[in-house]
């Protein structure tokens, strides 16, 4: 099985023990590590941060002692914006220039492939996204002709039904991608006005969402029905939680909220907590399991956080094995307890290690 793990370059800027550099990563933990994110500038792939090249080097030296590790560079992301991607993909010359710039950049900096993180193609971009993927793959095939190992091509896709329908021709793009990471998290957010888990495995009776689509099981099944081969589908598992501020004494699933949760000490983003911050939060908190959804949440005072723990990730891995998927994807290594100092287990990357162990179990 694949264990595809994202590393986010901005994690270097977190304070103190939250600061994560690629040399802190475990070279034997994941089969693939994806560096997020690269930029596109003047229609060429480019670094996002001035220091990215140094971090690329740190990441890719992990392969010195684990030659089986593959690294990919993810281009795009939330800050890049859909419009900029749209402009490049929809213009034949811009698309060509971008595609041509990718292989030398990846080769120079020691990457084994490219991950496309266009978040997200609009309805009018659907065909252009397919073309971009098809032409990028063709370029990778051509570039490898002199006997080089072919560069890998993957894409991170939304797990939301509405976005899947409008953004992706799943059957066509699947033909050209080496694997697809489905982002089976962020199903539920503060916009709903109630508490709810952002990455439930199943819908469950407790699901307060107004649809039956906001869960991992539905998203995976839908992708498969649309023509994604199970052998290429990698299922996302988050090492972060989504938090809410409760608006009343109600604390269960579907309780009213006044907004996102308080920012974490290190990640400093309202409504989001890294797993290592959750481990801190759990001291003195009340933990519940949402039985039908097979995921936990915790409450403390007026704070509510839905997250994944070692038990829930094992359930998710068992599910993806039952579905005969290609493996698991983790967002993100730097949100796991990468130092092993927060979660009281004397184990670095406890969630990712639990995923790895579950994937290896017979």
């Amino acid at each position: 099985y694949k264990l595809v793990c994202y590393y986010t370059s901005w994690s270097q800027y977190r304070e103190g023990d939250g600061s994560c550099f690629p040399d802190a990563l475990d070279r034997f933990l994941c089969t693939h590590i994806i560096y997020s994110f690269a930029n596109i500038s003047n229609d060429h792939i480019d670094t996002w941060e001035w220091n990215d090249v140094t971090l690329y080097g740190m990441l890719n030296t992990l392969k010195n002692r684990n030659p089986n590790l593959k690294t990919l560079l993810s281009v795009g992301g939330w800050n890049f914006g859909s419009q900029r991607f749209s402009k490049i993909a929809s213009n034949t010359q811009s698309r060509r220039t971008f595609i041509k710039s990718v292989p030398p950049f990846l080769r120079t900096h020691g990457f084994d492939g490219l991950d496309l993180a266009w978040l997200y193609p609009g309805r009018r971009d659907k065909q252009h996204f397919t073309t971009l993927i098809k032409e990028m793959k063709a370029e990778f095939i051509k570039e490898a002709q002199p006997g080089k190992k072919q560069l890998l091509l993957s894409a991170a896709l939304s797990a939301g039904k509405v976005t899947i329908d409008s953004s992706y021709d799943i059957a066509k793009i699947s033909q050209h991608l080496d694997f697809i990471s489905i982002m089976t998290y962020d199903f539920h957010g503060a916009w709903r006005g109630t508490t709810g888990h952002h990455s439930p495995l199943f819908r469950g009776q407790e699901d307060a969402s107004p649809d039956r689509f906001s869960n991992t099981d539905y998203a995976v099944g839908y992708m498969l029905r649309l023509g994604a081969p199970a052998s290429k589908l990698v299922m996302g598992i988050p090492t972060f939680g989504r938090s809410f501020t409760l608006a009343s004494s109600e604390t269960g699933v579907g309780a009213p909220i006044s907004g996102p949760g308080i920012p974490g000490r290190f990640t400093k983003e309202a409504g989001t907590l890294a797993y290592y911050e959750i481990c801190d939060f759990l001291r003195g908190a009340t933990v519940h399991r949402i039985l039908g959804q097979q995921v936990p949440y915790a409450t403390k005072g007026n704070q509510w956080v839905g997250y994944d723990d070692q038990e829930s990730v094992k359930s998710k891995v068992q599910y993806l094995k039952d579905r005969q998927l290609a493996g698991a994807m983790v967002w993100a290594l730097d949100l796991d307890d990468f130092q092993g100092s927060f979660c009281g287990q004397d184990l670095r990357f406890p969630l990712t290690n639990a995923i790895k162990d579950a994937l290896a179990a017979t």
């Epitope: 800027y13 930029n39 003047n42 001035w50 220091n51 090249v53 140094t54 710039s101 950049f105 900096h109």
Partner: antibody, heavy 115, light 107 residues
């Protein structure tokens, strides 16, 4: 072997202009950011300007902003520094340097601004 | 702008000595600190990047440590070819800035 060779330095009067070039070889020039760093006689190092691999982003020291322009031609593997409105305090050896951590430097070219 | 302050500005040492140079940043720069060696009439040479990573080809007697605002370059056993001027530089944010240099001379 990585090589960076600067050229274009010389003696110029205050208010004059010069264009420095840095010819790069031995690495994929188009995949790296590049910079100019200078050193006045008997003084320390001073960063001047940087440009991203795609030319999409440029940065300048306050002391040269509005007077100097960094550019690159990836098809020619060459980095440039156009220096206008030169002042006596711009007198220095100018080095081009590769990457974010300046892992390779050229041998430098001397620019003397004097009347 | 981030100010970089090196100390000492010069030092005298003998071959075989352990030498330590410190560099302080005026604000937190995480690990984005590089060390360079420069000999008279020559271009600078990168020794250490990201505070503690030894540049390829640099002897292992050179080491770097620190994060945040305080950093150290250590030469464990000074060799004749190590007499030079050493500069620290922050690459955390623009404008990129150097320390004023530390000249290592023969005692």
């Amino acid at each position: 072997e990585v090589q960076l060779v600067e050229s274009g330095g010389g003696l110029v009067q205050p208010g004059g202009s010069l264009r420095l070039s840095c010819a790069a070889s031995g690495f994929t020039f188009s995949s790296y950011a590049m910079s100019w760093v200078r050193q006045a006689p008997g003084k320390g190092l001073e960063w001047v300007s940087s440009i991203s691999s795609s030319s999409g982003t440029t940065h300048y020291a306050d002391s040269v902003k509005g007077r100097f322009t960094i550019s690159r031609d990836n098809s020619k593997n060459t980095l440039y520094l156009q220096m206008n409105s030169l002042r006596a305090e711009d007198t220095a050896v100018y080095y081009c340097a590769k990457g974010g951590a300046f892992d390779y430097w050229g041998q430098g070219t001397l620019v003397t601004v004097s009347s | 702008d981030i100010q970089m302050t090196q100390s000492p500005s010069s030092l005298s040492a003998s071959v075989g000595d352990r030498v330590t140079i410190t560099c302080r940043a005026s604000q937190d720069i995480s690990r984005w600190l590089n060390w360079y060696q420069q000999k008279p009439g020559k271009a600078p040479k990168l020794l250490i990047y990201a505070a503690s990573t030894l540049q390829s080809g640099v002897p292992s007697r050179f080491s770097g440590s620190g994060s945040g605002t305080d950093f150290t370059l250590t030469i464990s056993s000074l060799q004749p070819e190590d007499f030079a001027t050493y500069y620290c530089q922050q690459s955390y944010s623009f404008p990129l800035t150097f320390g004023q240099g530390t000249k290592v001379e023969i005692k």
